[in-house]
């Protein structure tokens, strides 16, 4: 059943669900700061456009009575609980800044008819793809699978002359929320990644991963994993690695690679890091002083969620259109708006597009260097370093299957 | 976090969750009638034992604000919502008569630390197995898999001389809640059934099922499905069926086979029906006049849940033991109590044991006849009709794989 909305003439509210369970362990006050900073910008933009309206946020907190709080694994019902709370309090805004946890978001769409727009800083899983009123402002798993397939197939670059069609995936179940769903998408037999590969095996134990590094009978030279360099080191340590092994370390929301004076440790030499180009505008922001490089992206997604709300409000108000209609609920997609850090593009399904960056460790300088970028909007790889100083033979990425001659 | 309990000296309450989403489409007033009838019996039994205490039920209704109500597929969070409602109202009883929907029950255990006993008339899925404070009063999927494996392996009966190790499973996603989880358990690669079979294939389309009936290249002669004869007829119609096909129709909660003057339709001749021996004591009960043969079992489970609560109350009070302890919460298992219809046995994990009955259609009388019974408590098959008048050749069940000679 529907909830009445605080979305009247001249007064527009965004309901922000402040969940005990979150995709990133971010203090709720930081999220609140990001939202408030976003509101200030939106108010300015609306005033600048001659729209004299009031814009506010209502923060809806969990009561903590029931849920095991903490990570997203026990978050399934928390979003619905808050929706009930909003419903009882008659405090639904024009838009819901919803859960970041995939389970929670999925459940809200499963159990209710959501006829108002929901913006999420997370909801990474494939089960949240193609939701007609959902907008996701951090790269969802589908975008990762498209990059990987594109990269696997690429065979016309100076440093990658082989198409790949095989992979190991390391997934031990202790991953962060983003990694959990990224790896789930790679594991899922129905996913694009699985569909396009001729061989894929999930390694679940540390020992399986460690054994593959020097196993002459391995079925692939490529291992995809997700986490930061420290996570890899705990697993790999200083073990010897066969020369044609390539580890792809997915670490999208981590700006540390771009910080000054960062040197790549020796254990990263066989590793390509997939990340995103950093947003540096938050560095001096009032609410971001205490943010880690990872959390910066999460806070930025909340801030951009508010700016998106403002953008849509401005568009509809300027066109004299009603905000509480299905048209508004379905409009948060297939557009570009001005985010805090520059233009933000949403695809046809409301998912953020971004520039992914593949880094390698230069054997000369021990620095992370950009090998290529990938624009998720056009599904296109753009080589950057045509003569990388790789650890791999001839400074080229090896084939994914080693030719061992007659056996 | 924990909820205070209405479970004091001399006054004991059972909290009954009255869900919009239910395993069987049963009007809530019928459930309430069953509970109230059970309470009358419990009060009598306690008074008879010289225990002058008050026993009541508090019925907790969903507010219907959020959930898509109806079947169990959108029930995940409803149990938790009611638990929150109980928590806010400070109305938790000694025991929770909980959700019948698997999703809902599973979620309650996933998201909370349930330290009080929960009784369910349903929660059929494997994901609700082995919950330390959960009691299930309708046969869960695990029990079905144990019967099927036992029956497949049996090869020393006059009418079954072959061990089977293959099966098709028909599962099109429109099944009732009990069937949905029974078939899920057969499909699951980790289940006992899958583990013990050398070949198993799930048929998801009507046409796949229909084609198998006469397919010379089929990999198994045995098809397991779940539903009533009408469901089978819609699927199979009057199509010809190869003579060595055996359809196992799981229809546990349906007493119609045992009613007087029931004749088996012709399309049931290749079918073995797995059901349970009927509880006829409900037929004249005040609350069961309007119950269908299926719903009788559901109402009976609620009634028996109340009787189990009474049994445990009596046991602990007579022993001078505290009711609001972990010991009480973990005690609803590995016992036999007097149900409405006779003794009810719970296994080590709190799941009801029953006598399953395998019926065949007599080609002579066109009546359903008992072929064998299976006691889930001891995992034992007991043949009943040693000379069944089967449709199958030599009145014996065929091998599961037809020997086609040299190909």
């Amino acid at each position: 059943s529907q909830v009445s909305q605080n979305c009247h003439n001249g007064s527009y509210e965004i309901s922000v669900l402040m969940m005990d369970n979150s995709a990133f362990a971010e203090p709720l006050e930081n999220v609140e700061d990001a939202v408030n900073e976003g509101l200030e910008i939106v108010r300015g933009r609306l005033q600048n456009a001659g729209l004299n309206v009031t814009v506010n946020a209502s923060f809806m907190y969990s009561d903590g009575l029931i849920h095991n709080s903490g990570d997203c694994r026990s978050s399934t019902c928390e979003g619905l609980d808050l929706l009930r709370k909003i419903s009882n309090a008659k405090r639904m805004g024009c838009v819901l800044m919803g859960p970041s946890c995939t389970y929670s978001t999925f459940q809200m769409y499963l159990d209710t008819e959501l006829s108002y727009p929901m913006i999420s800083a997370g909801s990474f899983g494939l089960s949240c793809d193609y939701k007609e009123t959902l907008t996701r402002l951090m790269s969802p798993a589908r975008k990762l699978t498209y990059f990987l397939v594109n990269f696997w197939k690429t065979n016309d670059l100076p440093f990658k002359t082989y198409s790949w069609s095989t992979s190991y995936v390391y997934k031990n179940g202790t991953e962060s929320e983003d990694c959990f769903w990224y790896l789930n998408a790679l594991e899922a037999s129905v996913s694009y990644f699985s569909h396009e590969l001729s061989f894929k095996l999930v390694l679940r134990q540390d020992k399986e991963f460690q054994d593959i590094l020097m196993d002459h009978n391995r079925k692939s030279n490529v291992i995809v994993m997700c986490g930061d360099p420290q996570f890899l080191y705990k697993l790999k340590g200083d073990r010897a690695v066969a020369e044609d092994i390539v580890i792809i370390l997915v670490d999208l929301f981590n700006d540390q690679y771009f910080e000054d004076n960062v040197t790549a440790p020796d254990y990263m030499k066989n590793v390509l890091v997939l990340t995103q180009s950093p947003g540096n505008s938050l560095l001096n922001s009032s609410f971001s002083r205490n943010l880690s490089p990872t959390k910066r992206d999460f806070a930025l997604a909340y801030l951009n969620g508010i700016l998106l709300f403002g953008h849509m409000l401005k568009t509809f108000l300027e066109n004299g259109e009603n905000i509480t209609t299905p048209k508004f609920a379905h409009a948060f997609r297939n557009l570009t708006f001005e985010g805090y850090d520059g233009p933000v593009t949403l695809d046809d399904w409301g998912d953020v597009d971004s520039t992914m960056v593949l880094l390698y460790t230069s054997v000369d300088t021990k620095k992370y260097k950009v090998l290529l970028t990938y624009d998720t909007h056009v599904n296109q790889t753009n080589p950057v370093d045509m003569s990388p100083t790789f650890t791999w033979k001839n400074s080229k990425l090896p084939n994914d299957i080693t030719d061992r001659g007659p056996q | 976090s924990q909820v205070s309990q209405n479970c004091h000296n001399g006054s004991y309450e059972i909290s009954v969750l009255m869900m919009d989403n239910s395993a069987f489409a049963e009007p809530l007033e019928n459930v309430e009638d069953a509970v109230n009838e059970g309470l009358e019996i419990v009060r009598g039994r306690l008074q008879n034992a010289g225990l002058n205490v008050t026993v009541n039920a508090s019925f907790m209704y969903s507010d219907g604000l959020i959930h898509n109500s109806g079947d169990c597929r959108s029930s995940t969070c409803e149990g938790l919502d009611l638990l929150r409602k109980i928590s806010n109202a400070k109305r938790m009883g000694c025991v929770l008569m909980g959700p019948s929907c698997t999703y809902s029950t599973f979620q309650m255990y996933l998201d909370t630390e349930l330290s009080y006993p929960m009784i369910s008339a349903g929660s059929f899925g494997l994901s609700c197995d082995y919950k330390e404070t959960l009691t299930r009063l309708m046969s869960p999927a695990r029990k079905l898999t144990y019967f099927l494996v036992n029956f497949w392996k049996t090869n020393d009966l006059p009418f079954k001389t072959y061990s089977w190790s293959t099966s098709y499973v028909y599962k099109n996603g429109t099944e009732s809640e009990d069937c949905f989880w029974y078939l899920n358990a057969l499909e699951a690669s980790v289940s006992y059934f899958s583990h013990e079979l050398s070949f198993k294939l799930v048929l998801r389309q009507d046409k796949e099922f229909q084609d198998i009936l006469m397919d010379h290249n089929r990999k198994s002669n045995v098809i397991v499905m779940c539903g009533d004869p009408q469901f089978l007829y819609k699927l199979k119609g009057d199509r010809a069926v190869a003579e060595d096909i055996v359809i196992i129709l799981v229809d546990l909660f349906n007493d119609q086979y045992f009613e007087d003057n029931v004749t088996a339709p012709d399309y049931m001749k290749n079918v073995l029906v797995l059901t349970q021996s009927p509880g006829n004591s409900l037929l004249n009960s005040s609350f069961s006049r309007n119950l269908s043969p299926t719903k009788r079992d559901f109402a009976l489970a609620y009634l028996n849940g109340i009787l189990l609560f009474g049994h445990m109350l009596k046991t602990f009070l007579e022993n001078g033991e505290n009711i609001t302890t972990p010991k009480f919460a973990h005690a609803f298992r590995n016992l036999t109590f007097e149900g409405y219809d006779g003794p009810v046995t719970l296994d080590d994990w709190g799941d009801v044991d029953s006598t399953m009955v395998l019926l065949y259609t007599s080609v002579d009388t066109k009546k359903y006849k008992v072929l064998l019974t299976y006691d889930t408590h001891v995992n034992q098959t007991n043949p009943v009709d040693m000379s069944p008048t089967f449709t199958w050749k030599n009145s014996k069940l065929p091998n599961d794989i037809t020997d086609r000679g040299p190909q």
């Epitope: 933009r45 600048n48 456009a49 540096n280 505008s281 | -």
Partner: antibody, heavy 119, light 107 residues
Framework: QVQLQQWGAGLLKPSETLSLTCAVF????????WSWIRQPPGKGLEWIGE???????NDNPSLKSRVTISVDTSKNQFALKLSSVTAADTAVYYC?????????????WGQGTLVTVSS | EIVMTQSPATLSVSPGERATLSCRAS??????LAWYQQKPGQAPRLLIY???TRATGIPARFSGSGSGTEFTLTIGSLQSEDFAVYYC?????????FGQGTNVEIK
């Protein structure tokens, strides 16, 4: 108080490349778009294009193929290059700051640089 | 692009009188319109944004109105320092475009 200070060559020959730089003092650089606007002698204002601290640009299509706007955040500076100039490009060139990020109107202006294109 | 047309090209007004300047857009710009004042040899100065909101430090005698395609800048009582060229500018879309200007001169 925010101040914009601009400099660059004032006299160019046709076909040369105009090059101007604008430095920002006394305010945040990252929260704004920074524009170039020109005004031919005795005429009205023409917006050339804009850039933010990340290098995202929007240009006037009438000039686009000739315009390059760049940014150096380490120095809080942005620059304009206009290639293949002709006498029609003679104007006072202003750098300006939007009143707020993407606001599209300009509350702080440089002092202006007269660029003359003459053979 | 959106073409901005100002009228009149020149407006002669006596000090202390009211001046009314018009600006028309070739298509709707909602209220995304700004007004600037420019004196000889100086950079333009922002007066009004959002069609009617005065920028910081702008006297109350300056007021803006209108929406869509028709806009007006009114100077309530002209002071000697108000004689200048006034430009309207739309910022609804890119490219940002200015009107050709109205020169307010002493009558």
């Amino acid at each position: 108080q925010v101040q914009l200070q601009q400099w660059g060559a004032g006299l160019l020959k046709p076909s040369e490349t105009l090059s101007l730089t604008c430095a920002v003092f006394g305010g945040s650089f990252s929260g704004y778009y920074w524009s170039w606007i020109r005004q031919p002698p005795g005429k009205g204002l023409e917006w050339i294009g804009e850039i933010n601290h990340r290098g995202n640009t929007n240009d006037n299509p009438s000039l686009k193929s000739r315009v390059t706007i760049s940014v150096d955040t380490s120095k809080n500076q942005f620059a304009l290059k206009l290639s293949s100039v002709t006498a029609a490009d003679t104007a006072v060139y202003y750098c300006a700051r939007e009143r707020g990020y993407t606001y599209g109107n300009f509350d702080h202006w440089g002092q202006g640089t007269l660029v003359t294109v003459s053979s | 692009e959106i073409v901005m047309t100002q009228s009149p090209a020149t407006l002669s007004v006596s000090p202390g009188e009211r001046a009314t300047l018009s600006c028309r857009a070739s298509q709707s710009v909602s209220r995304n319109l700004a007004w600037y004042q420019q004196k000889p040899g100086q950079a333009p100065r922002l007066l009004i944004y959002g069609a009617s909101t005065r920028a910081t430090g702008i006297p109350a005698r300056f007021s803006g109105s209108g929406s869509g395609t028709e806009f007006t800048l009114t100077i309530g009582s002209l002071q000697s320092e108000d004689f200048a060229v006034y430009y309207c500018q739309q910022y609804k879309t890119w490219p940002r475009t200015f009107g050709q200007g109205t020169n307010v001169e002493i009558k």
